[in-house]
């Protein structure tokens, strides 16, 4: 068209994909009557009539815009709905009277890309490659126009650098007219890049201005040769028997070499390979003192077959051996003395304590306990505790039972038992002594003996209550080679209404236990002593 070059620049209208573009015809009244206007789209310099206005009434022309155009603002504005990227072109309005004039509008279309998707090269990158290797790929889908990509490493933008950094970007047009951008970052990496954080950023424009979207940060597997191998022990600090100890090999290479852990045989001084779990960790559970020794790790690079050896590491599993007490089963006469000696070995300095088993009372701090002028109450348990003060929880104990020779000692001398005539009584009688006594009863019935511990016996008698029994009562006699002793059980008739807690009625029968709930006289509670005989 002659003189078109002198035409003013078109008015710019910016709109996002999917929204409505308002195309306002900027002809003044002098330039044309807006009640008689033709609208054209210009594509590749070809004009196509798309809409006509006559006497203020609009009419779409058949074609791609037929369904999306409408007249607004008393005919001065053409509304284009559902804008697509293909709508980015020049639209013009042409007035017919008084003379033909036109007004041009440049429609610009925008669409923000989706969040960038970054994929790291799963195969990783060797540090000694000759040229840049693929680090990661960034994809920005469905943007318009094509967004710009910037790659970052540790928060700093990466620039193209010959033989070091190369960014290769390409785009595809979707059927929608939107662009998908793919950018590949290639780089030569060094060992220090093993922890580097890479991400990509998409820069794009919208009618509201410039915007950007960032991908997540990724690290790329970087492969570099091992230079050093070492051992790590968990937990750190002092180890003790019973702990779970893990010995693992570590290397500064990636991938790590094939590890083997060996322990020096103290006899042959040869390194002997230990069996590790699937993760190459040597687990000592529970750790024992035999696990102490010199460990080392060998790392074998299966590609180069180069083998590296760690510095040896001394492992010390602290222990306390079984505690030995001598004499182990002391027997003493009343009035005599006894020296108990406690021994144990340890990898650390030991502290010894003697406790009375029944009360927990500390009797002595040290390995030797001296007991003088022994009374029979001194019989029973004494516990030696060997502990390592510098390692909490590392201790061993040994119980020794002191047996004091003596005739039987009854749990009670006499006791009243409430009974009913014709009930079956369950009587019990307890005695202690060394040697362990046997118990007999002065009445016929079913008796059974239970060894409570080696110095204590409990006899149970089932007997029917008869008038004769009520008159005589029941005696139990405990005897050993050193003498005998008797307990008397007095039987008292009780009315049904005055049953005491000592007797209970079950299906017409009553059982009454004559042994006390607490042995007022006895120190044989909770004893663990060797036992003498019961006659077989």
């Amino acid at each position: 068209v002659p003189g078109e070059a002198e035409q003013p620049a078109p008015e710019l209208v910016e709109v996002e994909v999917g929204s409505t573009a308002l195309l306002k015809c900027g002809l003044s009244q002098s330039q044309g009557n807006l009640s008689h206007v033709d609208w054209f789209s210009v594509h590749k310099e070809k004009r196509t009539l798309i809409f006509r206005v006559r006497q203020g009434q609009g009419q779409s022309e058949p074609g791609e815009y037929e369904q999306r155009l409408s007249l607004q603002d008393r005919g001065a504005t053409l509304a284009l709905t559902q804008v697509t990227p293909q709508d980015e072109r020049i639209f013009l309005c042409q007035g017919k009277r008084p003379r033909s004039q036109e007004y041009r509008i440049q429609l610009r279309v925008y669409k923000a890309p989706e969040e960038p998707n970054i994929q790291v090269n799963p195969l990783g990158i060797p540090v000694n490659s000759k040229e840049p290797e693929e680090v990661a790929t960034c994809v920005g889908r469905n943007g318009y126009p094509i967004p710009q990509v910037i790659w970052y490493k540790n928060g700093r933008p990466l620039k193209e650098e010959k033989n070091r950094v190369h960014i290769q970007s390409s785009q595809t047009v979707e059927s929608s007219g939107l662009y998908t951008l793919q950018s590949i970052l290639k780089a030569q990496l060094v060992k220090e890049d093993k922890d580097a954080q890479f991400y990509c950023e998409l820069n794009y424009r919208l009618p509201s201005g410039n915007h950007m979207k960032e991908s997540r940060e990724v690290t790329v597997p970087v492969f570099y040769p091992t230079e050093k191998v070492w051992l790590e022990v968990e937990p750190v600090g002092m180890l003790k028997e019973g702990d779970r100890v893990e010995i693992r090999c570590l290397a500064d290479g990636n991938p790590p070499p094939h590890f083997s852990i060996s322990k020096q045989n103290p006899s042959t001084r040869e390194a002997e390979e230990e069996t590790t779990n699937d993760n190459g960790v040597l687990v000592l559970e529970p750790a024992r003192k035999e696990h102490s020794g010199r460990y080392e790790c060998q790392g074998l690079d299966l590609d180069t077959m180069i083998s590296l050896l760690s510095e040896p590491q001394e492992l010390l599993v602290n222990y306390v051996s079984d505690v030995r007490v001598s004499p182990a089963a002391p027997e003493r006469q009343e009035g005599s003395s006894l020296t108990l000696t406690c021994e144990a070995e340890s990898s650390q300095d030991l502290e010894f304590q003697w406790l009375r088993e029944e009360t927990g009372q500390v009797l002595e701090r040290g390995p030797v306990l001296q007991l003088h002028d022994l009374k029979r109450e001194a019989g029973g348990g004494y516990r030696c505790v060997a502990s390592v003060p510098s390692i909490p929880g590392l201790n061993r104990t040994q119980l020794v039972n002191v047996a004091i020779f003596g005739p039987p000692w009854m749990a009670f001398k006499e006791r009243k038992v409430w009974v009913k005539e014709n009930m079956v009584l369950n009587l019990s009688c307890e005695a202690s002594g060394h040697p362990r006594p046997t118990i007999s009863w002065n009445v016929n019935g079913t008796a059974s003996e239970q060894d409570q511990d080696p110095q204590r016996v409990l006899s149970t008698l089932n007997v029917l209550v008869t008038p004769e029994l009520l008159e005589t009562g029941v005696e139990c006699t405990a005897s050993n080679d050193l003498g005998k002793n008797t307990s008397i059980l007095f039987l008292e008739l009780v009315n049904l209404t005055t049953l005491t807690p000592d007797s209970n009625t079950t299906t017409g029968l009553s059982t009454s236990t004559a042994s006390p709930h607490t042995r007022a006289n006895s120190t044989s509670t909770e004893r663990k002593l060797p036992e003498p005989e019961s006659r077989g």
Partner: antibody
Framework: QVQLVESGGGVVQPGRSLRLSCAAS????????IHWVKQAPGKGLEWVAR????????YYNEKFKGRFTISRDNSKNTLYLQMNSLRAEDTAVYYC???????????WGAGTMVTVSS | DIQMTQSPSSLSASVGDRVTITCRAS??????????MHWYQQKPGKAPKLLIY???NLESGVPARFSGSGSGTDFTLTISSLQPEDFATYYC?????????FGQGTKLEIK
């Protein structure tokens, strides 16, 4: 030192009697149990009897009850085993041995040999 | 009576060997963690000598290579490293009840 010494063994005819002695020294005789243990030639050990010298209480292996009697003389710190109606199967070494109240034998005499033969 | 069965009846071993002798009682000889089982060594023409008392306690003066273990009915005497002077006959004995009985003996001979 603690010692037990047996004596009284020898050759005896079946049906006759023999008294074995066991002299104790080096410990308080009345505070321990003294036992007799039999060992027939090439055979194992067999417990015969025990006495507590402090109270004179005795126990026997049923196998020897009635023919054998254990006794003591505290003034001499000596233990005895009276063996009556001897039989060929009584031929053995007889040991005396000491125990406490747990009945393990911590001190033994050297033994005395009894041979019953016609 | 409680029967005591020792095994083996005899065994041949060499100096330095680890040797185990077992003894089984016909009923339990243990009470409250204490076991009335004892072990003796006897050499030809000599009296028996106490080695282990109450199943696991080493008698004073007995070398530490001797050890005992077990409870209930099953017991073991172990010699960790045989010495020339250990070739002898070994007996177990219970004292759980009367009558006390011994095992039949295990004769340990030089291979």
């Amino acid at each position: 030192q603690v010692q037990l010494v047996e004596s009284g063994g020898g050759v005896v005819q079946p049906g006759r009697s023999l008294r074995l002695s066991c002299a104790a020294s080096g410990f308080t005789f009345s505070n321990y149990w003294i036992h007799w243990v039999k060992q027939a030639p090439g055979k194992g050990l067999e417990w015969v009897a025990r006495i507590y010298p402090g109270t004179d209480i005795t126990y026997y292996n049923e196998k020897f009850k009635g023919r054998f009697t254990i006794s003591r003389d505290n003034s001499k710190n000596t233990l005895y085993l009276q063996m009556n109606s001897l039989r060929a199967e009584d031929t053995a070494v007889y040991y005396c041995a000491r125990s406490g109240g747990y009945w393990y034998f911590d001190v033994w005499g050297a033994g005395t040999m009894v041979t019953v033969s016609s | 009576d409680i029967q005591m069965t020792q095994s083996p009846s005899s065994l041949s071993a060499s100096v330095g060997d680890r040797v185990t002798i077992t003894c089984r009682a016909s009923k339990s000889v243990s009470i409250s963690g204490y076991s009335y089982m004892h072990w003796y060594q006897q050499k030809p023409g000599k009296a028996p000598k106490l080695l282990i008392y109450l199943a696991s306690n080493l008698e004073s003066g007995v070398p530490a290579r001797f050890s005992g273990s077990g409870s209930g009915t099953d017991f073991t005497l172990t010699i960790s490293s045989l010495q020339p002077e250990d070739f002898a006959t070994y007996y177990c004995q219970h004292s759980r009840e009367l009558p006390y009985t011994f095992g039949q003996g295990t004769k340990l001979e030089i291979k």
